[in-house]
């Protein structure tokens, strides 16, 4: 007799007999910018605080009838799914809400900006415990609005935002297309994507995960015990602030980063059926369903990895693409892939004081992808050694030569329009792990990192024949920082990482010939921090 | 999801001026530029959020703010100041006609200017 | 079926702390579903809702008697009880305990009042 | 709160009529009124949930009507089972009660 969107969050540990994850959120404080609520329905009542906050858009319509429930309606159920007393998420969280949207639903930039605002000054004049602001809004892109989520978020304050239900890239909305900001699609009990009429969730890179997000029960504010169903990102993004308090209660401490690496790592994997997607966003969009962590305690042991996705670069002939990890975490690896196979690789740059992963678009293709592995690595000093294109017929090597460094990813980034075209494989010799190696015309990039505790190992899996798609993942306990493709084949569209597999594409291979350069190897670099495993059983 | 993203539309705007001398000018070269959203129904015209460059103070805010309603009055046109920002980006919101844009973008701190636009619940 | 039965001291002194436990027999007070409540009625005058609480411990008042009002549940019991403090000659009424259905979930019935224990008076007076 | 007030205060008939008793609230419920029928020193029992949905196990002569602020119970044809006080309730904004309809017998 637990609504659905509920027993999907919840780890089955806790389903036994109904029972349900502990009252959490209790210290966390959860902002709500949506349209006035109903603050004395049941499922809320006490638990929301009603700021004196209004900035509104008068509605659209000499006819318009204000309907006090109805004008409360859409932010009285997503109160109700963060933290109702019987169909909430987090239900020891207290919230506080602004309105910036009017009785049909509709607000404006500028509202939201001066709803942000009154967050961060509230939060100067009275600083509380961790802060997470909900936004089940969206617009068109905002540059504006996107530098203020910026802020805020480097402020300590968590973002959640729905990634907007225009079937569409939610790269092209706002806040949906702030990187700082926890960007939420909507899922439903089949864990497909959801159909909102002749529209349904947004998709794309700039989406961060999914969520429960149709036929969802929480308060109606028809009357002050009613529950209604609603659908949409909204709800969706109202699950994951909700999981979010969950895990700040239990962890005042964590970061931005930390927590966004953690609501990935606990999350559902490969449950979404991609076919709804666009073909060209497919690759690009996140195959992960929120859940709660299995338990309240922390995961602090684990080395948390995540995949980020440039923007594609255009297909002018010189055009790159550029992938960034957020401030606190590290790049661990650099990929590249471009659907045409056109691509003269990639390569990690300096900019700015921190790494990039920077892909570079060749001549005749149609543009392409950065793909970056950010990666959280306390107290580590990463560098980037590069080998340029060597004289020798064996091919480019670079190692990680300083003491205590390991290698946790290999890129490599060519001049030359078509790499590989006519030229053998150069395999790797055995036995070298902490080396990459590549074309003799291409120059090698190792990402050597020194971190307490760091190990990695080199993985590979190669198939002899052509194959469209060549994996390998690394095993229980170690996690994917580095992925790439041995040097020798033409057909190779890119590497990237999904959750902790590496995935090599490869042209469609109808078009391939059944010869040695059709065969195809993923290399995978796994690593693990011992040091972060003593740390936990410390602690506990 | 990086701020050149976006399937927005930008005019970029010439900073120098014969007609108005200002003090604080800014540095020869320097370009703001104006942003609008790309979805028309969406768009909010008459109502611009004026950015200014990341250090700006407040007073530094109003001033600018003052100084775009002194420059426009000379001309004819009357402009609101609805909302001066601090605290999370320096600027203010300006209710205006969009013929002053081109002015407005060469006050001194302007880093860009965005016109308002709707959001939605979802 | 369900069966609610109130029980408690028939007399309290006014200024001190009115007492009354519900035991529920024939299901679980355990359920997701319900809602478990108090209301009353001065004799011969009309019900006045007092309070309801869920099987997590989370409870809703009246807000007129907010102030002084304590709802518990022990579910190990299959139990929930009504503290009421301070209380006056205007406290004098037959309390009763019933179940309401929380709305969550649709198929659990009605969300109402239903059913009802039979009642117990409590009279303040010293 | 929401007032209900219920009329009228008595309502004395014979076994056989039919009853119409009153319910107004002080502003909108929407449809979320009940109907509870009380005999002496009995606990209230739900008769009608929702303006007009019977309760399981009433009988097909209690009919309710009405939304917003005017709602009707009618009893097409008394019992003698039926003599009783009836009460209205709504929950559109926390829980009232109505003064309550005492129906006697002429």
């Known amino acids: 007799s637990i609504p659905w969107n509920l027993e999907r969050i919840t780890p089955p540990r806790y389903r036994a007999d109904e029972y349900q994850p502990p009252d959490g959120g209790s210290l966390v404080e959860v902002y709500l910018l949506d349209t006035s609520i109903q603050s004395d329905h049941r499922e809320i009542e006490g638990r929301v605080m009603v700021t004196d906050f209004e900035n509104v858009p008068e509605e659209d319509g000499t006819r318009f009838h204000r309907q006090a429930s109805k004008c409360d309606s859409h932010g009285t159920h997503l109160a109700g799914v963060v933290s109702g007393r019987d169909a909430g998420v987090a239900k020891g969280a207290s919230m506080r809400s602004l309105r910036v949207l009017n009785c049909q639903g509709k607000g404006t930039v500028s509202g939201t900006l001066i709803g942000l605002e009154f967050i961060r000054k509230s939060q100067l004049v009275q600083p509380v415990g961790p802060l997470v602001v909900l936004l089940p809004l969206a617009g068109g892109y905002s540059r504006v609005l996107n530098a203020a989520c910026q802020r805020l978020a480097r402020a300590g304050v968590v973002l959640v935002t729905a990634a907007g239900n225009f079937r569409d890239d939610a790269c092209l909305y706002s806040p949906a297309s702030a990187p700082e900001v926890i960007t939420v699609g909507a899922t439903n009990a089949q864990d497909q994507p959801v159909t909102l009429g002749t529209l349904g969730t947004n998709f794309g890179r700039c989406v961060d995960l999914f969520a429960p997000g149709e036929d969802i029960i929480g308060a109606s504010s028809d009357c002050s015990t009613c529950f209604v169903s609603q659908s949409g990102t909204s709800q969706a993004a109202a699950h994951v602030a909700g999981i979010a308090a969950m895990m700040l209660s239990a962890e005042p401490e964590l970061t931005l980063a930390e927590l966004r690496q953690r609501l990935i790592h606990f999350s559902a994997k490969d449950v979404i059926n991609e076919a709804w997607f666009p073909e060209d966003q497919r690759v690009l969009t996140p195959n992960l369903v929120a859940a709660l962590p299995p338990s309240t305690h922390g995961a602090g042991w684990q080395l948390f990895c995540r995949t980020v996705w440039s923007a594609h670069s255009g297909p002018t002939r010189m055009a790159t693409a550029v992938a960034r990890c957020a401030p606190d975490e590290e790049l661990l690896s650099c990929s590249s892939f471009s659907r045409s196979g056109k691509r003269r690789g990639e390569r990690m740059e300096a900019q700015g004081g921190k790494l990039v992963c920077r892909a570079h678009n060749a001549f005749g293709g149609e543009g392409v992808y950065a793909i970056a592995r950010c990666c959280l690595l306390p107290q580590a000093n990463c560098s980037v050694h590069t080998a340029p294109p060597a004289e020798a017929s064996m091919g480019t090597r670079v190692h990680c030569h300083q003491q205590g460094h390991v290698l946790t990813g290999c890129s490599s980034h060519w001049e030359v329009e078509d790499l590989g075209t006519h030229k053998p494989p150069v395999l790797r010799p055995r036995g070298q792990p902490n080396q990459c190696v590549g074309h003799r015309e291409a120059s090698i990039h190792a990402s050597c990192c020194h971190a307490p505790g760091l190990e990695c190992k080199v993985k590979e899996h190669g198939i002899p024949a052509p194959q469209e798609q060549v994996t390998v993942a690394c095993e229980e306990g170690w996690t994917l920082t580095g992925c790439s493709a041995l040097p020798g084949t033409s057909h190779v569209l890119g590497a990237y990482a999904v959750d902790n597999t590496c995935v090599v594409r490869s042209r469609d291979v109808s078009t391939t010939g059944s010869t040695s350069e059709g065969a195809v190897t993923a290399v995978a670099i796994c690593c693990r921090s011992r040091h972060l495993a003593q740390a936990s059983q410390e602690l506990q | 999801q990086e701020d050149e993203d976006g399937d927005y539309e930008e005019l970029v705007l010439a900073l120098r001026s014969e007609e108005d001398g200002l003090a604080e000018a800014p540095e020869h070269g320097t370009t703001a530029t104006f942003h609008r959203c790309a979805k028309d129904p969406w768009r909010l015209p008459g109502t611009y959020v004026v950015v200014l460059k990341e250090e700006t103070h407040l007073s530094q805010s109003e001033r600018t703010a003052r100084r775009l309603q002194a420059q426009a009055a000379r001309r004819g046109y009357l402009t609101k100041i609805l909302h001066v920002f601090h605290g999370l980006l320096p600027g203010f919101l300006v209710k205006m006609s969009g013929d002053l844009l081109e002015l407005a973008l060469k006050l001194p701190h302007v880093d860009y200017i965005e016109e308002d636009s709707s959001v939605f619940a979802q | 079926q369900l069966q609610l039965q109130e029980s408690g001291p028939g007399l309290v002194k006014p200024s001190e702390t009115l007492s009354l436990t519900c035991t529920v027999s024939g299901g679980s007070i355990g359920s997701s579903s319900y809602y478990w409540t108090w209301i009353r009625q001065p004799p011969g005058k009309g019900l006045e809702w007092i309070g309801s609480?869920?099987?997590?411990?989370?409870?809703y008042y009246n807000p007129s008697l907010k102030s002084r009002v304590t709802i518990s549940v022990d579910t190990s019991k299959n139990q929930f009880s009504l503290k009421l403090s301070s209380v006056t000659a205007a406290d004098t009424a037959v309390y009763y305990c019933?179940?309401?259905?929380?709305?969550?979930?649709?198929?659990?019935?009605?969300?109402?009042?239903?059913?009802w224990g039979q009642g117990t008076l409590v009279t303040v007076s010293s | 709160e929401i007032v209900l007030t219920q009329s009228p205060a008595t309502l004395s008939l014979s076994p056989g009529e039919r009853a119409t008793l009153s319910c107004r609230a002080s502003q909108s419920v929407s449809s979320y009124l009940a109907w509870y029928q009380q005999k002496p020193g009995q606990a209230p029992r739900l008769l009608i949930y929702d303006a007009s949905n019977r309760a399981t196990g009433i009988p097909a002569r209690f009919s309710g009507s009405g939304s917003g602020t005017d709602f009707t119970l009618t009893i097409s044809s008394l019992e003698p089972e039926d003599f009783a006080v009836y009460y209205c309730q709504q929950r559109r904004n926390w829980f009232t009660f109505g003064g309550g309809t005492k129906v006697e017998i002429k």
């Open positions: 609480i869920n099987y997590r411990g989370s409870t």
């Open positions: 019933a179940r309401e259905n929380s709305g969550v979930v649709p198929a659990a019935g009605p969300n109402w009042f239903d059913p």
